[in-house]
Amino acid sequence: KKEDGESTAPTARPKVLRCKCHHHCPEDSVNNICSTDGYCFTMIEEDDSGTPVVTSGCLGLEGSDFQCRDTPIPHQRRSIECCTERNECNKDLHPTLPPLKDRDFVDGPIHHK
């Protein structure tokens, strides 16, 4: 989801944005800070064992609108929040996993053949 009522149309920022990165630091990052023309993000998702994993970093302007939209993916619990209002704004993002639905138990990946 977008924070602070931002419009969903991606527009070029006049200046580079610095974001905290964790588990998602590109080669050009320094001291766990990455740079982008798009958004900072923080994401929580379940790994293969069902453990929640938090990652954060930079999303380039290209394609970031789609990535920040947080469209539900079948059989995957994941939530992402994006921001641009200040440098390292994603330090203050705390997305939570969507609640388990009944069918996630019955129809989860473990039961697929």
């Epitope: 580079v16 990052s29 320094v30 740079s35 930079c58």
Partner: antibody, heavy 116, light 112 residues
């Protein structure tokens, strides 16, 4: 038009500190980073660091950490760089420069002379 | 830090000649966003640098079309198709992909 005004020269004694100024006009001050660059006579350009006036977020070249401190006064659209414990090695021209994804406008530079 | 190596250090030319300056970086300047933040500046004696080319090949406003930039990855070139008297000075390449940002040592364009 974009302008970055810097004093022409400063003379200070070794061991002292100095605060160099850079007054911006012709654009929205908080929409761009302000960088500072050092140039010694006959030598190349060295990036000192940068500050985002909108949130006062700074990034420094490790080489200048402890030597340079970057600050801004958004009410007067002025950026400052404080240099401490000055030695002859700090004698140079210091430029401020507007930065978005690249530097597009530079100040005229302040010539700093450290001499007793 | 990324080292920017410029060649030649000095470039004597006749007015009207073509001039070519090379800039090589010690690592790729392709940013994680896909942009390449390699830029060219001209500094005339006693003045501050002026932006000529940004992001490899984009001419800054007011820069004559005799200036062109090209290259990718670690290897970049600035070309001046027909050198004029006002083009004389020191040319610097600069990268803003990796912190700390770094500059080439400069190429002095002078009259032969």
């Amino acid at each position: 038009q974009v302008q970055l005004q810097q004093p022409g020269a400063e003379v200070v004694k070794p061991g002292a500190s100095v605060k160099l100024s850079c007054k911006a006009s012709g654009y929205t001050f908080t929409n761009y980073w302000m960088q500072w660059v050092k140039q010694r006579p006959g030598q190349g350009l060295e990036w000192i660091g940068e500050i985002d006036p909108s949130d006062r977020y700074t990034m420094y070249n490790q080489k200048f950490k402890g030597k340079a401190t970057l600050i801004v006064d958004t009410s007067s659209s002025t950026a400052y760089m404080q240099l401490s414990s000055l030695t002859s090695e700090d004698s140079a021209v210091y430029f401020c420069a507007r930065f978005g994804y690249y530097v597009d406008y530079w100040g005229q530079g302040t010539t700093l002379t450290v001499s007793s | 830090d990324v080292v920017m190596t410029q060649t030649p250090l000095s470039l004597p030319v006749s007015l009207g000649d073509q001039a070519s300056i090379s800039c090589r970086s010690s690592q790729s300047l392709v940013h994680s966003t896909g942009n390449t933040y390699l830029h060219w500046y001209l500094q005339k004696p006693g003045q501050s640098p002026n932006l000529l080319i940004y992001k490899v090949s984009n001419r800054f406003s007011g820069v004559p079309d005799r200036f062109s930039g090209s290259g990718s990855g670690t290897d970049f070139t600035l070309k001046i198709s027909r050198v004029e008297a006002e083009d004389l000075g020191v040319y610097f390449c600069s990268q803003s992909t990796h912190v700390p940002f770094t500059f080439g040592s400069g190429t002095k364009l002078e009259i032969k």
